[in-house]
C-alpha cells in the first residue's frame, strides 16, 4: 500500500495546527515538565515489516484523535483550530485504515506488533493520567501539546522511512 503524498502533507498540517493551538506562554510551564517515556523504539521503522509499522502509526494517530476529542480538550483549546486538527487526524486515520486492510492481507502480523500497539496505548495512558493528576491545568495541557508534537514528529519520520522502503 502506498500512503498518498497527501497523507504526509496532512501530518505536517496537523503539526502546524497543533503548534498554533497554544493559549498560554509555555515559558511559565517549565516546572510541569514530565517524563511520559515515549516508546521511541516503536517509531524505528527499520525493525518493522510494513504492515506492523502502519498499525503502529494508526494506533498513534487514533490515540491522539481520542485525546483531543474529549470534553476536557474542548474546554482547553480554541474550537476552530481543534476542529481543523481533528479533521486532519481523521483523514490520516482513513488513509491508514485502507492501508492496514490491504497490508494485513499480504503479511501475517506477529505478536510483536501487539506489543508495539500496547506500548503506544500505555504511553497515552500515562499522558491521560498526568492530565488527571494535574487537574487538566493550562500548563498540563501545554506540556501534553509539546509531547504530542514530538510524537507526531516521530510518526512523520516513520512515514518517510516507509515511503523509502517502497
Amino acid at each position: 500500500c502506498d500512503l498518498p503524498q497527501t497523507h504526509s502533507l496532512g501530518n505536517r498540517r496537523a503539526l502546524i495546527l497543533l503548534g498554533q493551538m497554544g493559549r498560554i506562554s509555555p515559558f511559565s510551564c517549565l516546572k510541569d515538565r514530565h517524563d511520559f517515556r515515549i516508546p521511541q523504539e516503536e517509531f524505528d521503522g527499520n525493525q518493522f515489516q510494513k504492515a506492523q509499522a502502519i498499525s503502529v502509526l494508526h494506533e498513534m494517530i487514533q490515540q491522539t484523535f481520542n485525546l483531543f476529542s474529549t470534553e476536557d480538550s474542548s474546554a482547553a483549546w480554541e474550537q476552530s483550530l481543534l476542529e481543523k486538527f481533528s479533521t486532519e487526524l481523521y483523514q490520516q486515520l482513513n488513509d491508514l485504515e485502507a492501508c492496514v486492510i490491504q497490508e494485513v492481507g499480504v503479511e501475517e502480523t506477529p505478536l510483536m506488533n501487539e506489543d508495539s500497539i500496547l506500548a503506544v496505548r500505555k504511553y497515552f495512558q500515562r499522558i491521560t493520567l498526568y492530565l488527571i493528576e494535574r487537574k487538566y491545568s493550562p500548563c498540563a495541557w501545554e506540556v501534553v501539546r509539546a509531547e504530542i508534537m514530538r510524537s507526531l514528529s516521530f510518526s512523520t519520520n516513520l512515514q518517510k522511512r516507509l515511503r523509502r522502503k517502497d
Epitope: G19, L30, K31, R33, F36, E147
Partner: antibody
C-alpha cells in the same frame, strides 16, 4: 550533527547598535528553544533570555529586560541577540544554547562557540 | 528569582581524588537541576541534567544527586582533563539561574 554557529567577534563604540546571530543546523530548529547566556570577563554565567523560534515568543531575565532584544528567523534557522545602544558594561562573551522546551530532554545540551563583544571608546 | 548557591567557590585537588561540589536552591526546584563544565575560552558543556541523569558522552565518573533544594555533583576519580569550572543551573522556573561557579584547580 547538531551545531549552533555564532557570528564573529565584534568591537563597538558606546552608543552603537549591534545584532549577533546563532545559526542552528542538524536538528529541527523550531522544535527547540534558543537561550542566550552572558559571561563577563572572569565572571560566571548569566541567563539573559529565551525564544521559541516556532512562534517567536520570548522571555527575558529581569536584569536584561529592556536592555536587549531576542528574535529569530525560522526560515534560516537563526536566532539573534541585539542592542540598540551599547554600553562599556556590555563587554562580554555571549553564548546561545538550545533548550528542549517543555519536552523531557536535556536542557542546554548544545552551545554555540560564543561571540565576544567588546565595547570601548 | 531562585538563587543558586554553590560551595566551595574553589577547591584544590589531585588526580585520582574524589571531588564533591554542592549546590543549594533558595526554594524547592524538584529535580530541575543541571550541571555544566567550562574550560577557559570554551563554551560550557552539559554534564548532568534533571539532577542525576548523565548526559550522553559524559564519563561515568561524573554523577549527580539531590532533589528539592540540595544537590551534589561528584567526580569519583579526578582526571587531568577535569580541571575546570563547574556551574549548577536551575530550570524549574524563569528566570533560569546559575550558581556562581566552582573552580577545580590542581593541588
Amino acid at each position: 550533527e547538531v551545531q549552533l554557529v555564532q557570528s564573529g567577534a565584534e568591537v563597538k563604540k558606546p552608543g552603537e547598535s549591534l545584532k549577533i546571530s546563532c545559526k542552528g543546523s542538524g536538528y529541527s530548529f523550531t522544535s527547540y528553544w534558543i537561550g542566550w547566556v552572558r559571561q563577563m570577563p572572569g565572571k560566571g554565567l548569566e541567563w539573559m533570555g529565551i525564544i521559541d523560534p516556532s512562534d517567536s515568543d520570548t522571555a527575558y531575565s529581569p536584569s536584561f529586560q529592556g536592555q536587549v532584544t531576542i528574535s529569530a528567523d525560522k526560515s534560516i534557522s537563526t536566532a539573534y541577540l541585539q542592542w540598540s545602544s551599547l554600553k562599556a558594561s556590555d563587554t562580554a562573551m555571549y553564548y546561545c544554547a538550545r533548550h528542549p522546551g517543555l519536552n523531557w530532554a536535556p536542557d542546554f545540551d548544545y552551545w554555540g562557540q560564543g561571540t565576544l563583544v567588546t565595547v570601548s571608546s | 528569582d531562585i538563587q543558586m548557591t554553590q560551595s566551595p567557590s574553589s577547591l584544590s585537588a589531585s588526580v585520582g581524588d574524589r571531588v564533591t561540589i554542592t549546590c543549594r536552591a533558595s526554594q524547592s526546584i524538584d529535580d530541575f537541576l543541571n550541571w555544566y563544565q567550562q574550560k577557559p575560552g570554551k563554551a560550557p558543556k552539559l554534564l548532568i541534567y534533571f539532577a542525576s541523569s548523565l548526559q550522553s558522552g559524559v564519563p561515568s565518573r561524573f554523577s549527580g544527586s539531590g532533589s528539592g533544594t540540595d544537590f551534589t555533583l561528584t567526580i569519583s576519580s579526578l582526571q587531568p582533563e577535569d580541571f575546570a569550572t563547574y556551574y549548577c543551573q536551575q530550570s524549574h522556573t524563569l528566570p533560569l539561574t546559575f550558581g556562581q561557579g566552582t573552580k577545580v584547580e590542581i593541588k
